[in-house]
């Protein structure tokens, strides 16, 4: 593919990403699918810098990012390394509660009210933010 | 709640054309990814094409491509399959899918001379 | 292209069986994978998504596990409203493709 130089229609540029902030909310997996679908990822937040610019544009709101411990450890779906990276959680989190009575515990991270970062059950349908990096290949196909 | 309502099929001669439409409501919209799909009289269910929330990127099955034209207007909450050339092969109900979360009822597209 | 395929084609079952349904993908497909059930003149409705999570409002008898290339969908105690057949859909990468569906009924 060619490389993308420009953030899509409906895209906000920042600092070489583009991220894009959905208006309603789906599941942890099905936010996922989507901006896998629209070739990037679920936001992966690794500066204070960018933390500050995705809470401003989410507001006080529950929303996704692209951080879960589904498999055990947490990671990023980029790959971003989570041990040596940026992180936010509220006090006391993450803490993987069982007490919800939907099954399981708390395998997905999201951005708080406050923008802190809580694991939720995956199956909430919280809003979700999608990045891609400008510079990198577009895997997107013509209009066939 | 979420309704995808489908309409605009019929009965339609070979090589004749045909416009479905998806409405939708109960949805954000433009938050979703949408597909068409269908489904022969007694057959399996077929993917038929996909078109991103923008609709800056589609995808057809390869035995449609050029004959199926998908689009979505996001302003009116809808989506579209403009089918040209029809075939007897075609004669399926057609189903709109947000995602590949909600489904619509179908609508029956039968082309037969 | 990625090919499904669906085991059994068909089985007959009484209320109250456990059934379980197999989907193999002709390569790895991660957990892009989800099961929907069609009852006779009706839309499908999605069942299981990511392979393993209980759509909303779906009963719990339905479960969902797998994940690359081999993935099942089991009914714990089937119920007469569960008759019907049941599809499993990649959508990993384009185009997405349905299994060949399994059609459960009354033994």
């Known amino acids: 593919g060619s490389e993308r130089t420009c953030c899509p229609v409906n895209w906000v540029e920042h600092e070489r990403s583009c991220y894009w902030f959905s208006r309603s909310g789906k599941a942890w997996a099905d936010a996922d699918n989507y901006c896998r679908l629209e070739d990037a990822h679920l936001v992966v937040v690794t500066s204070w810098e960018e933390q500050k610019f995705v809470q401003h544009h989410i507001g006080p709101v529950n929303t996704w990012m692209g951080l879960h411990d589904q498999n055990g450890p947490w990671k990023w779906v980029d790959g971003t390394d989570y041990e040596t990276g940026f992180k936010n959680w509220r006090p006391e989190q993450p803490d993987d509660w069982y007490g919800h009575g939907l099954g399981g515990g708390e395998d997905c991270a999201h951005f708080t009210d406050d923008g802190r970062w809580n694991d939720d059950v995956c199956q909430r349908p919280y809003r979700w933010v999608c990045e891609t990096e400008l510079d990198k290949a577009s895997q997107e196909p013509p209009l066939l | 709640q979420v309704q995808l309502v489908e309409s605009g099929g019929g009965l339609v001669k070979p090589g004749g054309s045909l416009r479905l439409s998806c409405a939708a409501s109960g949805i954000t919209f433009s938050d979703y990814y949408m597909n068409w799909i269908r489904q022969a009289p007694g057959k399996g269910l077929e993917w038929v094409s996909y078109?991103?929330?923008?609709?800056?990127?589609?995808f057809y099955a390869d035995s449609l491509k050029g004959r199926f034209t998908i689009s979505r207007d996001n302003a009116k909450n809808s989506l579209y399959l403009q089918m040209n050339s029809l075939r007897a092969e075609d004669t399926a109900v057609y189903y709109c899918a947000a995602d590949t979360i909600y489904w619509g009822q179908g609508t029956l597209v039968t082309v037969s001379s | 292209d990625i090919q499904m395929t669906q085991s059994p084609s068909s089985l007959s079952a009484s209320v109250g069986d456990r059934v379980t349904i197999t989907c193999r993908a002709s390569q790895g497909i991660r957990n892009d994978l989800g099961w929907h059930q069609q009852k006779p003149g009706k839309a499908p409705k999605r069942l299981i998504y990511a392979a393993s999570s209980l759509q909303s409002g779906v009963p719990s008898r339905f479960s969902g596990s797998g994940s690359g290339t081999e993935f099942t969908l089991s009914i714990s105690s089937l119920q007469p409203e569960d008759f019907a057949t049941y599809y499993c859909?990649?959508?990993?990468?384009?185009?997405?493709?349905f299994g060949p569906g399994t059609k459960v009924d009354i033994k």
């Open positions: 859909l990649q959508h990993n990468s384009f185009p997405f493709t």
């Open positions: 078109i991103s929330s923008s609709g800056r990127t589609i």
